[in-house]
């Protein structure tokens, strides 16, 4: 049977019926419901929300909804022994202390169990010493400090501003530089947009607001104690000393009022250039230590957080496919929040809820998708993508054989300017075609398509008349599906104007002020952007689950492979002498990309012409499309990152949030001029070119005619 025989809705109305059922007012109600109390991972409140979602998804009409629990390592502040930072004088007296918690937002004064700001998984410790300001604590910032300015961070406490890169990378860089503690702070230059009031009068960060977040360097491992395997009842757990990715030095976040007090006394070297200056009225001196009058004063950290194995709960809902029930399209987003989760994650969870309700409504009317759709409400994303990763580890054999696509559904908005999409090249055409059919919610684009407003506001840097679509990085729950398992993945949300707003993320990210009111008053009062995101995410899931031929275009992969090969070649060509000396050639990679391009083109021609009424041939062609992403997986993984196995894409080694292309070659080339053994270093470059060329060629061959 085709999927259309399994339904009483005519084919051309399937997608329309689904989209028409999505309602902004419902998303608004769901968001309100999900944000009235904190839902921190591992807490009773988040378990109760899991059960509520399970119950509601059942009511909406899913075939089954189960809780999947795991016992993973989480981190919490000590309730009776709060974390803080102080300035101490020569007698050891604390003359200044940072805030113990954020002032509560209006209407939430009596809410209990608001976790105070902390850096999850920080070890305990009370280091004291001189302060060094390290800008964003990026790799290049430490290069500037150590190589150009000859400033040694060893034995120092470093203070870094949030933004630009994932906070875990900042901590890793500080550790490698020998620091004994890290203070993270939000500078108004990055978290206070000019001309906008601070919360509760606008969407800017108040001086007492603080960004929470984990500081792990898991590299895709999931639960730090059970890398590679699910943290189930019979799991073997590593000792804490062998745990994956834990920081070794105390770390704590603060707001800009407190940062001002630490930074205003800084002495030592002046900032190297204007890019090191934020917006506080301080000199942004690098240090080390305080100026003359205050030179005997030191900074002391007081960190008492604990790591605890704690139960978490995913909610997994199933809508069985009518024709190919053994092919899975997954829509997943997390449920756990740092506090109220007004944007992260509940603006996403509310959209997923409404998508489930719409699919359920169609199902109750007799329709079923062609393929099975799995819906997931992940737990413990904020603690290192733990819920999604443990579930994928538990179900890896099923997923690698049956996984068609994964669509992520974290925050629906990070602004209200235009659409932002990151996805596999296989989904480019799907996203283009879908957005051409959707109405733009943007002012000034009434009656125009979403594709048109998106392209106008966020044009592709390479192709005129097309919108920008970015590479997948990490920092969200698609990681295990894409980077480890090779399942085609994508994500979509509404974003800010990156041209005019250069602050990092959105100002109230991971603070107590991320409330329902923040969204309802300032970001999306009509919930029209949420609705658009629901249509994009839901529409992608619908097409992936229901189209007879999978909506993947392998030719788009060919185009980006050529672009990535050109890019990595040009990076390598910055060292022409060494390439000559060590006989480094990219011929094999360019040859493989050429072969991929030709084979993909021929496959696409066959895809147009084959007999779609022949279920065996249809399944065969769809399997070739489904397994193409899988073909880019190297079972051995990337060097020192065994769970990042995708050869074309990986999270940047310098910023987990960003995607890097040909990451094996890129990392081998990075800072190669400073390597002590150039012969060995260039040997590794050659090995990585070999791996990449082989993988591209092998992937191409999966698209060849089978016999």
């Amino acid at each position: 049977k085709s999927s259309n025989e399994a339904t009483n809705i005519t084919p051309k109305h399937n997608m329309k019926a689904f989209l028409d059922e999505l309602k902004a007012e419902n998303i608004k109600k769901f968001l309100y419901n999900f944000t009235q109390i904190p839902h921190l991972a591992g807490t009773e409140q988040n378990f109760q929300l899991a059960k509520q979602i399970q119950s509601q998804w059942k009511e909406f009409g899913l075939d089954s909804v189960e809780l999947a629990h795991y016992d993973v390592l989480l981190s919490y502040p000590n309730k009776t022994h709060p974390n803080y930072i102080s300035i101490i004088n020569e007698d050891g007296n604390e003359i200044f202390n940072t805030s113990l918690f954020e002032p509560p937002p209006p209407g939430y004064e009596n809410v209990s169990d608001i976790v105070p700001p902390f850096s999850a998984f920080s070890p305990q410790g009370m280091p004291e010493g001189d302060l060094v300001y390290v800008n964003y604590a990026r790799t290049e910032d430490f290069f500037k400090l150590e190589r150009d300015m000859k400033i040694n961070c060893s034995g120092k406490i470093v203070i870094a501003r949030y933004g630009k890169v994932f906070r875990g990378n900042k901590v890793k860089n500080a550790q490698l530089a020998g620091a004994k503690g890290v203070i993270l702070y939000s500078d108004p230059a990055d978290y206070f947009a000019p001309g906008v009031k601070s919360y509760p009068d606008g969407w800017n960060l108040p001086g007492g607001g603080v960004q929470r977040g984990n500081i792990l360097n898991l590299n895709g491992a999931g639960d730090p104690l059970t890398p590679g395997y699910p943290a189930n009842e019979y799991a073997y757990r590593r000792g804490i000393a062998e745990a994956v990715g834990l920081p070794s030095i105390p770390v704590h976040p603060i707001g800009y009022y407190d940062a001002q007090k630490l930074l205003e006394k800084m002495g030592g070297s002046a900032p190297p250039d204007s890019s090191w200056r934020g917006s506080l009225k301080v000199p942004y001196n690098v240090g080390p230590g305080f100026t003359g009058n205050f030179s005997t004063q030191k900074v002391k950290m007081h960190i008492h957080s604990t790591n605890e194995v704690t139960r978490i709960y995913n909610v997994i809902g199933t809508l069985r496919g009518a024709v190919e029930p053994d092919r899975y399209v997954i829509l997943g987003g997390h449920r756990d929040s740092w506090v109220f989760g007004g944007i992260d994650p509940q603006s996403g969870a509310a959209v997923v809820h409404e998508i489930v309700r719409s699919f359920g409504t169609l199902k109750k009317e007799g329709w079923r998708p062609r393929r099975t759709i799995l819906f997931a409400s992940w737990d413990a994303e904020e603690f290192g993508l733990l819920g999604s990763t443990e579930w994928a580890e538990e179900n890896s054999r099923l997923l690698q054989e049956r996984g068609v696509a994964y669509i992520n559904a974290d925050s629906s908005i990070e602004g209200n300017y235009t659409l932002r999409v990151d996805c596999t090249p296989l989904m480019y055409s799907l996203v283009h075609n879908l957005t051409k059919e959707l109405k733009s919610p943007d002012e000034g684009f009434e009656g125009k398509s979403l594709y048109e407003s998106w392209t106008k506001k966020s044009p592709s840097p390479e192709f005129s008349g097309m919108p920008r679509i970015s590479k997948l990085g990490s920092g969200n729950d698609f990681e295990v599906f894409f980077q480890r398992l090779g399942i085609a993945s994508g994500r979509a949300r509404y974003t800010k104007n990156w041209e005019t707003n250069k602050f990092s993320g959105y100002p109230l990210y991971h603070s107590v002020y991320e409330t329902y009111e923040l969204v309802e008053k300032f970001y999306d009062p009509m919930f029209k952007y949420h609705l658009t995101v629901a249509q994009v995410r839901g529409g992608m899931v619908f097409e992936l689950a229901n189209s007879i031929v999978l909506p993947f275009d392998c030719r788009d992969y060919a185009v980006v492979l050529r672009k990535y090969a050109d890019k990595i070649y040009s990076i390598s060509m910055k060292h022409p002498q060494e390439m000559k000396t060590y006989s480094v050639s990219f011929d094999s990679l360019f040859s493989a990309v050429k072969n991929f391009t030709e084979i993909a083109s021929k496959f696409s021609e066959r895809l147009q012409d084959f007999d779609k009424s022949n279920p065996i041939v249809l399944r065969m062609m769809n399997d070739q499309l489904m397994f193409l992403e899988r073909a880019f997986i190297d079972p051995l993984g990337l060097p020192d990152r065994p769970f990042y196995r995708h050869v074309i894409y990986a999270p940047s080694s310098h910023n987990k949030y960003a995607g890097e292309s040909f990451p094996g070659i890129y990392d081998a080339l990075f800072d190669i001029e400073s390597k002590v053994d150039p012969s060995k270093a260039w040997g590794e470059v050659k090995r990585q070119i070999y791996v990449a060329a082989f993988t591209v060629q092998a992937a191409a061959e999966t698209l060849s005619e089978v016999a």
Epitope: N97, L100, P103, P104, E109, S198, D201, G207
Partner: antibody, heavy 119, light 107 residues
């Protein structure tokens, strides 16, 4: 320089209303909250509520809910505090004071307005 | 509402003395405590906010410390101009509340 200038002393009968004004100068009027604090003779300070000229939001202490109204006139950068159904225990000096934001302490104060409620 | 309790309610001291006033909150207010000085017939004047941040123009002999529920205002060397009533106030949660005041008199 920042100045908050309040209206003059008032004598009112029980049951009447009083409207005290606070004229701001030397800063951007809409950028700061305006609070009202009162002090009964020989007593301590008591916070009554705030008015936010940026968005006209108000917040009143529970004790004054229903009796106090705070308004503004942007053209003259003036905030008004009206207290109705006056009783003798409302006899006090009423101060306006500004704060930078919702969470910030009151950095500049008016000179105070004495309100006497007496039959 | 958060209750603020000041002690002592009054104290006598001489010029040059070190004076300490304490303020206790009925629940943790982090560091969001302000100290005001008021002289007879005058409006209060902000000395310290956020527990220890000295308002500009306030002499450095005034200092604030504390966190959570216990706070102190210290005048390191009392000057003739410092004889006044001092109030603490929490500015973390509405309704804002004040301590009952501490009157510093000449011995």
């Amino acid at each position: 320089q920042v100045q908050l200038v309040q209206s003059g002393a008032e004598v009112k009968k029980p049951g009447a209303s009083v409207k005290v004004s606070c004229k701001a100068s030397g800063y951007t009027f809409t950028d700061y909250y305006m609070h009202w604090v009162r002090q009964a003779p020989g007593q301590g300070l008591e916070w009554m509520g705030y008015f936010n000229p940026y968005n006209d939001y108000t917040r009143y202490a529970q004790k004054f809910q229903g009796r106090v109204t705070m308004t503004r006139d942007t053209s003259t950068s003036t905030v008004y505090m009206e207290l109705s159904s006056l009783r003798s225990e409302d006899t006090a000096v009423y101060y306006c004071a500004r704060s930078d934001g919702y969470y910030d302490a009151m950095d500049y104060w008016g000179q105070g307005t004495t309100v006497t409620v007496s039959s | 509402d958060i209750q603020m309790t000041q002690s002592p309610s009054s104290l006598s001291a001489s010029v040059g003395d070190r004076v300490t006033i304490t303020c206790r909150a009925s629940k943790s207010i982090s560091k969001y405590l302000a100290w005001y000085q008021q002289k007879p017939g005058k409006a209060p004047k902000l000395l310290i906010h956020s527990g220890s941040s000295l308002e500009s123009g306030v002499p450095s002999r005034f200092s604030g410390s504390g966190s959570g529920t216990e706070f102190t205002l210290t005048i390191s060397s009392l000057q003739p101009d410092d004889f006044a009533t001092y109030y603490c106030q929490q500015h973390i949660e509405y309704p804002w509340t004040f301590g009952q005041g501490t009157k510093v008199e000449i011995k």
